[in-house]
Interface confidence: low
């Protein structure tokens, strides 16, 4: 996952990223504070800097890193590291270093250039971020227009592994392993013990050999209005065993089937080099959701979910030391408690409270891929602080044996926080800045016939800014 030519491959998908179009001696400038500029070139030296230097301070021409073309792929981010800059004034033996992270942004923003996010005074490292379409894997459209409406297949994308399909024509009844793994609109995700080729979206698993690629995403869905079918074509670069002049291809035909099941692909027929799958699913049926008070009607499912039995009281949920009050179609806390005005979900804290979304903003939806009713609240209180490079502060954190619930100035010249729960152990920190986001919450209701009312559990918390609850209850079970 590291190349030396301003290119890098995503090892799990085989996608090649190429940033060479950003290279050039003229380079770019990144402003720091209101004070000055850093000159920077991508994958090469900058004409405003000393020879061999990829980035330098504009005012002094002090090098903040030597140029190189070694692009790395790290957790869906492309990274270019310029090391061995000028000696860092604050630390003997350390040299300036620059870390440039390229982050996917499908459409180029108004300022298509690097931004200096932070300067770590301890390590003499400058952190830059560049949001650019060049860091995106080629996103294939996963929808198709049908008259005035759009049919979106993206709820069927498998986010973790792949769908399993079987070849019913094979005689061996003792073999219960899937014969195919399938994903749509994007490659299969890595699966433990199933080494499908990187980038494959349709993968055949022979009994006697390694999995083979029989289809990669070839384009967006296609509508056949006469047959009222939607097709997805897949092409591979794997030569067909029966005829080496051809490569394997696959096709999935989607048909409307209303109901609460999303369906799965099934092998319909196969010739020597082609595989045709059928997928019956409500996703391709004309759809509409209607919200009426605390009731959601989904036209694909032909069913109404009524949550009003959950709105008669609020529910308190505790995760670690944090307690949330959760309301369904009702305020999370009464007016006498205060501190969480208008909130549908509230983080309780003494007499104060933080709203994780206003009741007035409530939306109900049905998420087909999860077979779940989702209630969401938005526009709550402002999110807690984060560091200058966008890493969430972790509260509380331990520093010098004491616990802190907020950014502190102690022993540094500016407000800072730890980015882990124990600074004394990890020494990971950053300077604090305001968040420009507002708190939101979601409640994912899942069917569980054994739970009458049930109760919410904290499913995830993101940056103290977004909380998701999972709530298992028979209230959302279809008949």
């Amino acid at each position: 996952n590291e190349h030396d030519d301003c290119q890098v491959t995503n090892p799990s998908t085989g996608h090649l990223f190429d940033l060479s179009s950003l290279s050039g001696r003229a380079g770019f400038t990144a402003a720091y504070s209101e004070k000055g500029l850093v000159y920077m070139s991508i994958c090469g030296e900058n004409e405003n800097c000393p020879p061999g230097v990829g980035a330098c301070f504009g005012q002094t021409r002090i090098s903040v890193g030597k140029a190189n073309k070694r692009l790395r792929y790290v957790d869906q981010v492309l990274q270019l590291v310029y090391k061995d800059g000028s000696p860092c004034p604050s630390k003997s033996g350390l040299s300036y270093k620059s870390v440039i992270s390229f982050v996917c942004r499908p459409e180029a923003g108004p300022t298509n250039r690097p931004m200096l996010i932070s300067l770590d005074k301890q390590t003499c490292t400058l952190f830059f971020s560049w949001h650019t379409p060049l860091a995106c894997e080629q996103a294939t459209e996963c929808s198709v227009r049908n008259g005035s409406s759009i049919v979106d297949l993206s709820p069927l994308i498998h986010r973790t592994g792949g769908y399993e399909a079987y070849d019913e024509s094979e005689d061996d009844a003792s073999d219960t392993n899937p014969d195919f793994y399938i994903n749509i609109c994007q490659p299969l995700n890595p699966m433990h013990g199933v080494p499908c080729p990187a980038g494959a979206a349709v993968c055949k698993v022979p009994i006697d050999g390694p999995p083979i690629d029989i289809g990669r995403v070839a384009g967006p869905p296609i509508l056949n209005p006469i047959a009222n079918e939607i097709y997805l074509n897949f092409e591979s670069s794997t030569p067909c065993l029966a005829d080496k002049h051809f490569n394997y291809t696959s096709l999935i035909a989607f048909h409307c089937k209303r109901g609460v099941s999303m369906g799965t692909p099934k092998l319909l027929r196969t010739s020597e080099c082609d595989f045709v799958f059928e997928w019956e699913t409500p996703v391709v049926c004309p759809d509409e959701v209607r919200m009426d008070g605390c009731t959601l009607t989904d036209e694909q499912l032909l069913y109404s979910f009524n949550l009003s039995s959950l709105s008669t009281s609020t529910f308190k949920v505790t995760r670690d030391s944090r307690t949330y009050s959760v309301g369904v179609c009702t305020f999370a806390v009464g007016p006498e408690q205060g501190g969480c005005k208008d909130g549908g979900v509230c983080l309780l804290s003494g007499t104060k409270g933080a709203s994780f979304g206003r009741l007035q903003s409530m939306k109900l939806d049905y998420r087909h891929q999860d077979e779940a009713v989702v209630l969401s609240y938005v526009n709550g209180d402002r999110c807690p602080p984060e560091t200058d490079d966008g890493v969430p502060c972790v509260f509380p954190f331990i520093f010098n044996g004491k616990s802190y619930e907020e950014c502190i100035i102690e022993s540094r010249a500016k407000l800072w926080c730890s980015t882990t729960a124990d600074y004394d152990r990890d020494h990971e920190w950053g300077f604090c800045r305001h968040s420009n986001s507002y708190r939101t919450s979601s409640i994912i209701f899942k069917c569980d016939e054994d739970e009458d009312i049930g109760r919410p559990q904290v499913f995830s918390e993101v940056r103290g800014c977004d909380v998701t609850f999972e709530w298992k209850t028979k209230v959302v079970c279809p008949p």
């Epitope: 720091y32 907020e406 950014c407 010249a413 800045r433």
Partner: antibody, heavy 119, light 107 residues
Framework: EVQLVESGGGVVQPGGSLRLSCAAS????????MHWVRQAPGKGLEWVAV????????YYADSVKGRFTISRDNSKNTLYLQMNSLRAEDTAVYYC????????????WGQGTTVTVSS | AIRMTQSPSSLSASVGDRVTITCRAS??????LAWYQQKPDKAPKSLIY???SLEDGVPSRFSGSGSGTDFTLTISSLQAEDFATYYC?????????FGQGTKVEIK
């Protein structure tokens, strides 16, 4: 134009109290830490106190600890210094200053307000 | 608290002279030092931050250098408007502290 304007200075007796204000304009006040710095007549500069951008953290010079309180109202773009138990040695011109968020130091200063502690 | 010692306390110079003021910290403050200029009955004005970086709008005849404990402010060619008092200040650790000042007077 970035501007800081102090007010509230005056003559006060030893042991008395005074509240200084600093009105900010021309920048996003709520994003910056703010400082008070003072200068006794004919003397050098002395840092007095700092408050974080959101008011959650405050630090004081030893000479004023327990007597002075720094605060802010971000909705009014105003910084305050409440001075209690004033002493003759608190006589000075008091400046408010903006903290340079990125590199530290104080990059914008007010014109100052004079506090005289005298019986 | 970190002590900041400036030298000289005062100096006399003529227009066009090269002037150097030094500042010493009682302990390592890396490069977290600022220089300010103050004229009589006026507020201080920030000249240099991070030991060597010039504030916007400050003439290039001013420069700063140093790291650790020893720092220098240099005015390469003194102008009439530069006669003032100059202060160094550390912001490595609270409480922030200033040097006692250097008064630059006309010879």
């Amino acid at each position: 134009e970035v501007q800081l304007v102090e007010s509230g200075g005056g003559v006060v007796q030893p042991g008395g109290s005074l509240r200084l204000s600093c009105a900010a304009s021309g920048f996003t006040f709520s994003s910056y830490a703010m400082h008070w710095v003072r200068q006794a007549p004919g003397k050098g500069l002395e840092w007095v106190a700092v408050i974080s951008y959101d008011g959650s953290n405050k630090y004081y010079a030893d000479s004023v600890k327990g007597r002075f309180t720094i605060s802010r109202d971000n909705s009014k773009n105003t910084l305050y210094l409440q001075m209690n138990s004033l002493r003759a040695e608190d006589t000075a011109v008091y400046y408010c200053a903006r903290d340079d968020r990125f590199f530290g130091g104080m990059d914008v200063w007010g014109q100052g307000t004079t506090v005289t502690v005298s019986s | 608290a970190i002590r900041m010692t400036q030298s000289p306390s005062s100096l006399s110079a003529s227009v066009g002279d090269r002037v150097t003021i030094t500042c010493r910290a009682s302990q390592d403050i890396s490069s977290w030092l600022a220089w300010y200029q103050q004229k009589p009955d006026k507020a201080p004005k920030s000249l240099i931050y991070a030991a060597s970086s010039l504030e916007d709008g400050v003439p290039s005849r001013f420069s700063g250098s140093g790291s650790g404990t020893d720092f220098t402010l240099t005015i390469s060619s003194l102008q009439a408007e530069d006669f003032a008092t100059y202060y160094c200040q550390q912001y490595n650790t609270y409480p922030w502290t200033f040097g006692q000042g250097t008064k630059v007077e006309i010879k």
